[in-house]
Structure formats: C-alpha cells, structure tokens
C-alpha cells in the first residue's frame, strides 16, 4: 500500500528565534501542482513526444507515469479542458511488440485502455475522457512528472500558525 | 476576439497563382494544427492541407500536391497557402480553420474564417 | 480515400420535429468522425466531434451516435435556427480527411 501525504502538523516551542528552520516537509516546486506523492506540470506549449521527454529531463523530471487507473482519473480530472490533451511517458515498443513505460516497464492489460494503433512511432496521450495513441511526431501538450521530496525549508515561525 | 480572417482570393486564369493569407487572433495560433478546407459553388467541402503547430509535418490532398503549399508564420499569427498552376477545377472559396486540440492529427476544425474566393477562368 | 454517404440528401422537416441524419463509411473509422452545420454564405461550424462529444457552446438538442462504419446525427426539436446543411467528417489517420455529401434540413 502506497505512504499516505497528509498535512504536516508542527510542535511549536515556546521560546522561538525570529527565523527557525521547519522540520521536513513534502513540497513541490512552484508551478507544480500535488497529486497524492507527484508533483505535475502541465504544459503551455505543444510539442513532439520526444521533444516532450526532452523537456521533462531539463526540468529534472520525466513524462508521467500513470500507476493505475486511479491515478488516471485524478490526473484526468485536473485536465479543465475537454478540448486539450496531454502526452504521457508511455510509446510503442516495436522490438518488444508492447506499450513500455519510459522507466522501462511495460503496459499491464488491465491499466489503461488505448484506443487507437499500437504501431511503430505510436506514443500515447490523454484527454479529460480518454487515452489515446497517437503518432509520437504529433505536436501536443504534455505533463512533466517529479516525486516529492523532503526538503528543508526556513520559515519564520508566524507562518506555522 | 477569438477568429480567422482569410485574404488575397481573386481572379486568376488557369495557369497563374495566388497567395492566400489567414490572420489569427484571441487565441495562441502557434499551439494549434491548421488547415485550409475548400468549396466549390454550390458543392460540398474538400480539406486541402494541414500544417503543424511548429511547421514540421505538413500534409495534402492529392487533387493539390505539387501545385500548392502551406506555411506559417507564428511570430506574424498567419497562415498562407501559395496556389501555383491553378486550374478551373480549383475555383471555391477557400476557408483556413484551426483544429482541436484535443485529437492530435485527427484534426475537428472547430474555429473557420468566413472564406475568400478564388475564382480560376479565362 | 475514405467515403462518407450521407442520407438523405434533403429532409423537409417542421420547427419541433426530430431530425435524423445518417453517414456511412465505406470502411471502419471507429470514432473519428464529425458533425457540421453550414447555413447558406457561412463557413462550417462545428457541432459534435468524436462522434458523439457535444462541442462547446452547441445547444443540447444536437447529440450524435454511432462507431465503425454508421453514425447518426439528432435533432431532437427542430428550431428556426437549425434549418441548414449538415456535413459530416471523417478524421482517421488515413488521408485525406474527407467530408459526406450533405444534408439540406429545409422548412416543410
């Protein structure tokens, strides 16, 4: 069973200094958004997957991985737009004749279900509604994916309250 | 304001060219997939060519092939077609319209210019 | 290329009436079909994509069905507004995207 992420809650001392150093916390970085223990970010821009892949690596993450369908459904329902869609890290493997996640994985037959080909230069993408394949040259959106991650923050002890 | 506004149809005869050209605005043109969908007088509609949001892929009806050309230029909001060798058979109103975003090269056109005429006659 | 037949060709029809409009393809197209309203001197709009996804800002009347080679555009109550011709389209990766003949809806 996957760590619940539930809200920090801190012990505050009665003598404090004027700035303090905060205990652990799980944070994403600013323009991120959290879902459950990822970090995400939608694109602005439209581009080819491996552009897409690209762009996620320079950010110090990776396309999204999508574990289950619950996770697909709560990624789908931040997407407000039924008109857009997004790419995903997931493409047709044509040695392997499979869909393989880019951590190397391979699609299980019961996570999502692709409606289109499964043919070389195939890659997938998502809609509010749906899961898609696509030809991986096709210019789209795209979600970046980074786990969270401890990070020591300072604070000023007024903003614990 | 969110539209497409086509220009630079006319009269031509067969033989000659046209640019045609399609400003955009209200929206981010350089994120969506284009096309140019034709209608000849009292016909149905026939899609001519599509262009990718980057300009990269870019695709055409046969009835076209090596006679016209599509661009784009983002940092101006507009599209053109050059139409070279044109034929009677060529005479419609010419519409640009911009496609879904959602489908990928399964392009919906879900916002069109109101069209300009390109008439091909001796 | 992909053909789309579109019947009927003309429908005479009176403000409430239900309207139903078929295209055939000439071979499976799964889902990637549309639906267009085009009314004399205007550019196409678009209503229903993905064969049955109302499009924004489309009036709940219009609903579309069907997958593979038959598809169905409804009206449920005609209004004064919709008295037009109607196209389909299908989006297949195989190109040419292609559209249907059209269907004249015309005031009975």
């Known amino acids: 069973q996957k760590p619940s992420i539930g809200k920090c809650s801190v012990d505050i001392q009665q003598n404090r200094t004027k700035t303090t150093e905060r205990p652990d916390l799980l944070n994403c970085p600013i323009y991120w958004q959290q879902v459950q223990e990822k970090c995400l970010l939608f694109s602005h821009t439209v581009n080819p997957w491996n552009n897409s892949l690209a762009d996620c690596s320079t950010k110090e993450s990776s396309l999204l991985l999508i574990q289950d369908k619950d996770e697909l459904t709560r990624t789908q329902n931040l997407i407000h737009d039924k008109a857009i869609s997004f790419w995903i890290g997931l493409n047709f493997s044509l040695s392997e004749k499979n869909w393989k996640w880019i951590n190397g994985s391979f699609l299980s037959s019961n996570d999502l279900k692709i409606t289109g080909d499964a043919k070389e230069n195939s890659c997938v993408y998502i809609s509010q509604t749906s899961v898609y394949s696509e030809y991986c040259s096709t210019e789209m959106k795209w979600i970046c994916q980074k786990e969270l991650t401890l990070v020591r923050n300072k604070v000023s002890p007024d903003s614990w309250l | 304001q969110v539209q497409l506004v086509e220009s630079g149809g006319g009269l031509v005869q067969p033989g000659g060219s046209l640019r045609l050209s399609c400003a955009a605005s209200?929206?981010?043109?350089?994120?969506?997939?284009m096309s140019w969908i034709r209608q000849a007088p009292g016909k149905g509609l026939e899609w001519v060519s599509y262009i990718s949001p980057s300009g990269a892929t870019i695709a055409y009806a046969d009835s076209v092939k090596g006679r016209f050309t599509i661009s784009r230029d983002n940092a101006k909001n507009s599209l053109y077609l050059q139409m070279n060798s044109l034929r009677a058979e060529d005479t419609a109103v010419y519409y640009c319209?911009?496609?879904?975003?959602?489908?990928?090269?399964?392009?919906?056109?879900?916002?069109w210019g109101r069209g300009t005429l390109v008439t091909v006659s001796s | 290329d992909i053909q789309l037949t579109q019947s009927p060709s003309s429908v005479s029809a009176s403000v409430g009436d239900r309207v139903t409009i078929t295209c055939r393809a000439s071979q499976g197209i799964s889902s990637w079909l549309a639906w267009y309203q085009q009314k004399p001197g205007k550019a196409p709009k678009l209503l229903i994509y993905?064969?049955?996804v109302l499009q924004s800002g489309v009036p709940s009347r219009f609903s579309g069905s069907g997958s593979g080679t038959d598809f169905t555009l409804t009206i449920s109550s005609l209004q004064p507004e919709d008295f037009a011709t109607y196209y389909c389209?299908?989006?297949?990766?195989?190109?040419?995207?292609?559209f249907g003949g059209g269907t004249k809806v015309e005031i009975k």
């Open positions: 319209a911009r496609s879904l975003m959602s489908t990928g090269t399964h392009l919906y056109f879900d916002l």
């Open positions: 389209q299908q989006v297949t990766s195989f190109l040419p995207y292609t």
């Open positions: 209200g929206f981010t043109f350089s994120q969506y997939y």
């Open positions: 993905a064969a049955s």
